[in-house]
Interface confidence: medium
């Protein structure tokens, strides 16, 4: 049986916790990073879709992020296998209601940070 | 755009006490982990400690040198940080820097002199 | 706990040479929080790189960051008039929380 932290929803053997408020994505995996946690990796369409249906409309951060010219990258450094399209010209990326997109890593949204859930 | 806003150093004597203040301006400064580093003339930067937004609990944590005589505090209401400066040393002395916790934004720093 | 140490303390070049400043971690520390930093003469400290990597918003391509592990290096490609200034490496996290910064490199005009 999953178990997850307190406030963290359980979903395919990953705990992820969703944000009330707003940071930059540089202060939202601070945050994640102080809970042993990163900002969400996405890793399949169904944990996209999870993530797309409960999180509300709001904007959430993730854990892509690109230098200039470079490809996408998760947190932990493995490249993005393009599992589903991100819009827009920004170095950090985030779900809104349609599906991912990407900002400046300087504005402020909510987020989602990820880790893997405990099994007891 | 962001600004943080440092007034409050000054002139104090060993043993003295001396409160900093940083206003800060175009982010959600409630949301926002906030640190204070410093520089002695001369030398490099050092981190003093920093404080979590109260929603995620608000805690402090300090640098060795500082503990049990500095507190930082805030006032959300205010946007306003503080550094609150108990038994002042001479090795003290130094511009103080508000910072954003993720250090992309800076004060101008104020001057802290502690001497007799 | 981690210290920073930079290498060479005074860098002497002339305007439109390469700078290559070395930034050396006693432990393996995470690229996501090693940033490096610009101070001029009275005043506060600017950010250029974070992540190791990324620039900073207004950074100019000339400087670039690059490294993992524990050995981590800014670049200047083509120097200007206005870089000459003392440069900061810093590793910031939360394990410990607060941040430590590496002790300086002078960039001079040589």
């Known amino acids: 049986q999953a178990a997850c932290p307190e406030s963290w929803i359980g979903f395919q053997r990953k705990c992820f916790y969703f944000s009330d408020d707003t940071k930059n994505w540089t202060s939202s995996q601070r945050f994640c990073d102080s809970q042993d946690a990163d900002l969400a990796q996405v890793e399949s369409f169904q944990e996209l879709n999870f993530l797309l249906r409960y999180k509300g409309p709001s904007d959430h951060w993730i854990g892509l992020s690109r230098e200039q010219g470079q490809p996408w990258k998760w947190i932990n450094g493995t490249e993005w296998t393009r599992q589903f399209p991100i819009l827009g010209a920004g170095e950090c990326a985030y779900l809104n209601d349609k599906g991912a997109s990407s900002a400046r890593h300087y504005t402020e949204r909510k987020w989602i940070c990820s880790k893997s859930d405990i099994h007891v | 755009q962001v600004q943080l806003v440092q007034s409050g150093g000054g002139l104090v004597k060993p043993g003295g006490s001396l409160r900093l203040s940083c206003a800060a301006s175009?982010?959600?400064?409630?949301?926002?982990?906030m640190s204070w580093v410093r520089q002695a003339p001369g030398k490099g930067l050092e981190w003093v400690g920093r404080i979590k937004s109260k929603t995620d609990g608000g805690t402090t944590d300090y640098a060795a040198p500082v503990k049990g005589r500095f507190t930082i505090s805030r006032d959300d209401s205010k946007n306003t940080l503080y550094l609150q400066m108990n038994s002042l040393k001479t090795e003290d002395t130094a511009v103080y820097y508000c910072?954003?916790?993720?250090?992309?934004?800076w004060g101008q720093g104020t001057l802290v002199t502690v001497s007799s | 706990e981690t210290t920073l140490t930079q290498s060479p303390g005074t860098l002497s070049l002339s305007p439109g040479e390469r700078a290559t400043l070395s930034c050396r971690a006693s432990q393996s520390i995470s690229s996501t929080y090693l940033a490096w930093y610009q101070q001029k003469p009275g005043q506060a400290p600017r950010l250029l790189i974070y992540?190791?990597?990324t620039r900073a918003t207004g950074i100019p391509d000339r400087f670039s960051g690059s490294g993992s592990g524990t050995d981590f290096t800014l670049s200047i490609s083509r120097l200007e008039p206005e870089d000459f200034a003392v440069y900061y490496c810093?590793?910031?996290?939360?394990?410990?929380?607060?941040?430590?910064f590496g002790q300086g490199t002078r960039l001079e005009i040589k």
């Open positions: 910072t954003t916790d993720e250090y992309f934004y």
């Open positions: 810093q590793q910031y996290g939360n394990s410990p929380p607060g941040a430590t």
């Open positions: 992540g190791a990597s």
């Open positions: 175009g982010f959600t400064f409630s949301n926002a982990w």
